[in-house]
């Protein structure tokens, strides 16, 4: 019969790859003991006297270790061993998707520690400490309300992380306007235009998280391409939530995405969920010469070449650096493609 003391197991954290010696409580060195892990006997050659010696700890070494007096099978001591790593410098980023209400900061560790971590966030606006309210759903996010809009005073957000094996920290400093980044536009829909084989009508909505589009209007950036090609075409729109593509190719399925940005400040949102549409494919009636001329003048681009280069921020390229890139960067390898080329492509 195995008798178990009432005490909870001793919890011990050890570093991955290290060696550890587990004592059998306060048993003497020469006490005759047997060790088990998760109920399985351990080899006697792992013992140094009454102590258990584990070399080169792996994640699989985590478990409940128990030592028993060999004769009576009395449970002498239990150790709940957790193998893990100290935290590396956390990755911290802040973003305002609800400007001018406030912003949120989120964080993560670049590599797992395999053991519990505690994060502590502090936010300073100048010398004033601000409250960062924990997100009810996301444990690695907290929210800060803007107290002074259009402030030139910088924010400093610091995060420290600690676990049983170590501690690390990082901080970022930024201006209020640099972190403004709306959520992607919502409900992007593309429809064919009856009797117009080169037109697609695209509509979308301002992101619902953007609190005041009247006072803080957004501009939009649309990209589209036939599924069979890799190059995107781009259109920047200063206002409105609709656009008609006039240079689509008949019968080719298109993928369309939209991004948003505050008119004045911040960076482009990520791309919206993709909308798919195929232009009207029935053989169109013969158009008048005037109609053909009008068709040509309303076309955004006459080919799949990029539009005129203006410095814009590509939503798809945005990382932590939030750099500005040109449309040449967006398009990848840019070359003119004729309709003849298009018809020679086959779906993959």
């Amino acid at each position: 019969q195995r008798h178990s003391p009432q005490e909870a197991p001793h919890v011990q954290y050890e570093r991955l790859g290290s060696d550890v010696t587990l004592p059998c409580g306060t048993a003497n060195w020469d006490a005759a003991v047997t060790w088990r892990v998760n109920g399985t006997d351990l080899a006697p050659d792992l013992l140094n006297g009454s102590q258990l010696v584990l070399h080169g700890l792996e994640l699989g070494h985590s478990g409940l270790y128990a030592c028993f007096h060999r004769d009576s099978w009395h449970l002498r001591h239990q150790v709940l061993l957790h193998v893990g790593l100290p935290p590396r410098e956390p990755v911290l980023s802040c973003r305002s998707n609800t400007y001018p209400k406030g912003f949120y900061c989120s964080w993560h560790l670049p590599t797992p520690t395999y053991i519990p971590n505690t994060f502590n966030v502090t936010v300073l606006h100048g010398s004033k400490i601000m409250v960062c309210e924990k997100d009810p759903a996301l444990k690695n996010r907290c929210h800060i309300r803007y107290m002074h809009l259009f402030s030139t005073i910088k924010y400093k957000v610091s995060i420290s992380v600690s676990n049983a094996l170590g501690h690390n920290a990082t901080a970022i400093t930024f201006d209020e306007f640099t972190i403004v980044k709306p959520d992607p536009p919502e409900n992007v829909v593309a429809r064919p235009v009856p009797s117009n084989p080169r037109r697609l009508e695209v509509t979308w909505q301002t992101p619902s998280t953007w609190p005041d589009p009247e006072s803080f209007p957004l501009k939009f950036f649309l990209r589209y391409r036939p599924l069979i090609l890799d190059q995107w075409q781009h259109v920047e729109l200063s206002d409105g939530t609709a656009h008609t593509i006039t240079d689509a190719y008949a019968g080719k399925e298109y993928i369309i995405q939209v991004a948003a940005k505050d008119n004045e400040i911040g960076t482009w949102s990520d791309w919206s969920v993709a909308a798919h549409a195929t232009p009207w494919t029935e053989e169109p009636r013969h158009l008048t010469t005037e109609a053909q001329a009008a068709e040509t003048t309303t076309s955004t681009t006459s080919s799949l070449a990029p539009p005129p280069t203006t410095k814009i921020c590509d939503p798809g390229e945005l990382g932590s650096e939030q750099k500005l890139i040109s449309e040449e960067d967006l398009g990848g390898e840019q070359k003119l493609i004729s309709e003849e080329d298009l018809h020679h492509h086959h779906h993959h």
Epitope: P23, T26, N28, W29, A32, H69, D71, H74
Partner: antibody
């Protein structure tokens, strides 16, 4: 011949400190968990603290936790009891004892005791 | 923590008497109980370990029994040198180690 010899007992005022020593001989000291057990005058035995054979594990009675510290020097076959913030109720004979390696553990070897008197 | 209660606290007996001292644990301690004898001005001395095992060098008139929560120390025929204080001690769930409050055995 096994011997445990305690020393360091004295008369001290409440709030003061005292350090007891226990010198061991006649057995492999570094294999044994060592205890301090005390006995107020005319009263029963009270366990105070234990230190494991290698010094890695230490436990204390609630009555002394945070005030007393046990330590050992295996190279000198000696165990120590550092007693801080002494109270009148700490008065008594202090024995060091070596625990058995068999189960159930018992106090295999005892010293003769040293008297600690805490009085103003 | 496990509490140990001895009874009686003291008793008077004569040489040759059979004497029984009991010890009760506040919860089951299997057979992990030890008995000590202490004479005035001396350190305690182990008599019985594991409830019923006689320590080497201890006279056979001493015996122990019991398991779980109730234990007894019996001296079958008291000798003059047996007048002392007796303590039980549990080593089932430690630390802390706990002793009974002691039973003082006096000459009648």
């Amino acid at each position: 011949q096994v011997q445990l010899v305690e020393s360091g007992g004295d008369v001290v005022q409440p709030g003061r400190s005292l350090r007891l020593s226990c010198a061991a001989s006649g057995f492999t000291f570094s294999y044994y968990g060592m205890h301090w057990v005390r006995q107020p005058p005319g009263k029963g035995l009270e366990w105070v603290t234990i230190i494991s054979f290698d010094g890695s594990q230490k436990y204390y009675a609630d009555s002394v936790k945070g005030r007393f510290t046990i330590s050992r020097d295996n190279s000198k076959n000696t165990v120590f009891l550092q007693m801080n913030s002494l109270r009148t109720e700490d008065t008594g004979f202090y024995y060091c004892a070596a625990q058995s390696s068999t189960w159930p553990e018992y106090f295999q070897y005892w010293g003769q005791g040293t008297l600690v008197t805490v009085s103003s | 923590d496990i509490q140990m209660t001895q009874s009686p606290s003291s008793l008077s007996a004569s040489v040759g008497d059979r004497v029984t001292i009991t010890c009760r644990a506040s919860q089951s301690i299997s057979s992990y109980l030890n008995w000590y004898q202490q004479k005035p001005g001396k350190a305690p001395k182990l008599l019985i370990y594991a409830a019923s095992s006689l320590q080497s060098g201890v006279p056979s008139r001493f015996s122990g029994s019991g398991s779980g929560t109730d234990f007894t120390l019996t001296i079958s025929s008291l000798q003059p040198e047996d007048f002392a204080t007796y303590y039980c001690q549990q080593s089932y769930s430690t630390p802390p180690i706990t002793f009974g409050q002691g039973t003082r055995l006096e000459i009648k």
